[in-house]
Amino acid sequence: QFELEILSMQNVNGELQNGNCCGGARNPGDRKCTRDECDTYFKVCLKEYQSRVTAGGPCSFGSGSTPVIGGNTFNLKASRGNDRNRIVLPFSFAWPRSYTLLVEAWDSSNDTVQPDSIIEKASHSGMINPSRQWQTLKQNTGVAHFEYQIRVTCDDYYYGFGCNKFCRPRDDFFGHYACDQNGNKTCMEGWMGPECNRAICRQGCSPKHGSCKLPGDCRCQYGWQGLYCDKCIPHPGCVHGICNEPWQCLCETNWGGQLCDKDLNYCGTHQPCLNGGTCSNTGPDKYQCSCPEGYSGPNCEIAEHACLSDPCHNRGSCKETSLGFECECSPGWTGPTCSTNIDDCSPNNCSHGGTCQDLVNGFKCVCPPQWTGKTCQLDANECEAKPCVNAKSCKNLIASYYCDCLPGWMGQNCDININDCLGQCQNDASCRDLVNGYRCICPPGYAGDHCERDIDECASNPCLNGGHCQNEINRFQCLCPTGFSGNLCQLDIDYCEPNPCQNGAQCYNRASDYFCKCPEDYEGKNCSHLKDHCRTTPCEVIDSCTVAMASNDTPEGVRYISSNVCGPHGKCKSQSGGKFTCDCNKGFTGTYCHENINDCESNPCRNGGTCIDGVNSYKCICSDGWEGAYCETNINDCSQNPCHNGGTCRDLVNDFYCDCKNGWKGKTCHSRDSQCDEATCNNGGTCYDEGDAFKCMCPGGWEGTTCNIARNSSCLPNPCHNGGTCVVNGESFTCVCKEGWEGPICAQNTNDCSPHPCYNSGTCVDGDNWYRCECAPGFAGPDCR
């Protein structure tokens, strides 16, 4: 919406634009208006940008008015929250940034017979971007001075210079994001993609063999395993082998066979030859022992002098036999030499998946964390290890435990701090996540838990000399009483600075006003009106541009007055035979210098830019994608690095192209699945996925690969009459009219007779960008003065 707030009004004499008083007549003594004050209200008209503002024509962006808000002079800067002095013009279109604003102060007549009268009017053409900040404007010429402020604000969830970028925070399966101050989506932790609905997998998760639907997860494809899905699953039953691809069984050194279960180095693996026997590999899982003297048997285990060498280990007793010797083993040992520990783990007595460790003449169970006891038959109390980090309590469950988390914590061990930041912080504040809470870090000028409160910078009463303090965002403004100025009202105002008196008059400063001592030929508050000397002093025609009149204001006693027939843009040059010519200022031509030269004649704007003629100047409004004084520079659409996932960006006109890598698709290489999403085609275009590319079907008025270039068709043929310039605006257009014309297609002749340019009851005749005064008897001159 466009907002305008009237701040102050100064109409010292209570006059109207036509010089009359708002109410009643003038005091004959001091020529000031007597009786009633003006009943001042304001009218506002907002329309398309005009280089030369015209008063008529429709208010295409909206219009409104205030009620009567004051008299001759008033100051509303202190009255915040008072909507009487505010006009709000909502708009349902993209804000075009450039605009023309007409503000008129009117006197309400308070009766049905008399029409309201205009006091003063201001016009302003410019450019304004949406912002919370106000822009102050002043009307400082004419009978009344007034000050007002304007701003454009976007509706909730709308951003950008045109208030046409939509972003509404969300946290559900469609997306998990907040919006930054420019309306860009900022993904919550753990999410990515243009809609923030693609989970960021566990760090290190194989992009080729793993995927996830939830943040921090890593789900393996068939044939892959491990925390990061980067380990292949070997062939089932593969014993001493590995894999590079799923289901392989590549044998380790010295192993063979389809499942790598055949020992090719039995001697090295088992060292079967005892008593210094030499081992030779004879085939897979086969060997032969060469025994030293005094030993025999397949493993050289038989000693001829049996018990002499203490063959029985582990406290076994030796007995010589006909075959050699026999060992009687101590408990827990077995084998011909008592060197084999009896496997007390067969059968396995460990419950609940416990691992059995064989001991000498016994066993030990290594239990999983949830179980304890000799055979892991008892439920372990996991709470003894204090696994719960930030919890009210730990509950022991059978083969498990449960942490009852303190507020703000989650996860099995209550060690994950819940993110409490969900867009509660206002006014662009940043949010810091705390435990079971959050803290808003406010920008300057704001306070409160959610930065919702504007700090009152007026609390310290900074304004001096009775100035009224007005609190604003991160600053204050002092509204000074009459006679004082300065940011703290610390300066005594000099009303003569800058000098308001015209035509060389002397200015005298007073307590709350000024006084101009006029030269003999001038009168009025500011000595701006030429006295009508012709009532008393005879005038002499010097030439067709000059008259002379008697004056005691010059040494020669004569004053020369120049004709203003050439208007404000030229000087009169006298010619013989009572004729004259006009010497025009730069940028103007015509008999009376009333025509603005068309500086766009040479077509200076390139690349489809539209030229708007000014006074001895021009301005180029560039087609989408171009910038510069002559629209000569192609805007680099790759500057924001729009291509994701290693895509290479190529700049086009008002567009870019991403050359995607590694199977990524879409306008910005952001998708694995589709070339299309809602942002691919602009301006209502429909996106079609064509496999390895996308295609946009554009609505009327748009063209280009992503419907990003406005067709000139809305300006062909030129709909603007009387030399108006057509500016393409999507499917529509805007006409920038030449001087003297107005309206949406420049078809209406501006009323050059408004407001009354002819004095002394002269009649005004309106032409095309000119007027003529037909004077009453006894009066002459271009304006009958």
Partner: antibody, heavy 119, light 107 residues
Framework: EVQLLESGGGLVQPGGSLRLSCAAS????????MSWVRQAPGKGLEWVSS????????YYADSVKGRFTISRDNSKNTLYLQMNSLRAEDTAVYYC????????????WGQGTLVTVSS | DIQMTQSPSSLSASVGDRVTITCRAS??????LNWYQQKPGKAPKLLIY???SLQSGVPSRFSGSGSGTDFTLTISSLQPEDFATYYC?????????FGQGTKVEIK
Amino acid sequence: EVQLLESGGGLVQPGGSLRLSCAASGFTFSSYAMSWVRQAPGKGLEWVSSIEQMGWQTYYADSVKGRFTISRDNSKNTLYLQMNSLRAEDTAVYYCAKSPPFYGQFDYWGQGTLVTVSS
Amino acid sequence: DIQMTQSPSSLSASVGDRVTITCRASQSISSYLNWYQQKPGKAPKLLIYAASSLQSGVPSRFSGSGSGTDFTLTISSLQPEDFATYYCQQSVVAPLTFGQGTKVEIK
């Protein structure tokens, strides 16, 4: 008061088509995601499809993907479900439901419309 | 897809009893869990969203807790109008999935 009113249910033969509508009132329709949830006779709830507020994103259950299409007309405050190639197992009461932009819960439900697929 | 498992499938209780229903997710879903109540022939009604937030207009005897994979719906003092079927639902990622339901009957 928020109101969701489903219509368009009825008896249809296997392989046939139906179009369900859900008329919404009492809230700003264009600000909310909408969904269809169904319930076969004597069974639990099964999510069918969802569409976000602008109609840019849609999601479907695997069981209906390629056969059902969800859409919306924000100017008419209406949600639609176009059901093609209907099967006996699609027989259910179909509910439309609205979701606020945080947490994805279904905060308001319609009263449902019965779809029977039988020869 | 994320599986949601409710227990028990049904339970019998008396007016005034404290009733607890649990819901377990096959993967961690943070706090994206909602609870619904459904009476025969009626549409479901939202009770709890985001694991523990009470929907406006729902009596305070209903409460929710849990995060990650394990969640609980508690009715502190069962009232006659609370006899119904209760469903949990995850809403973090599509496809959205419901638990199979828990029927609360009069003992």
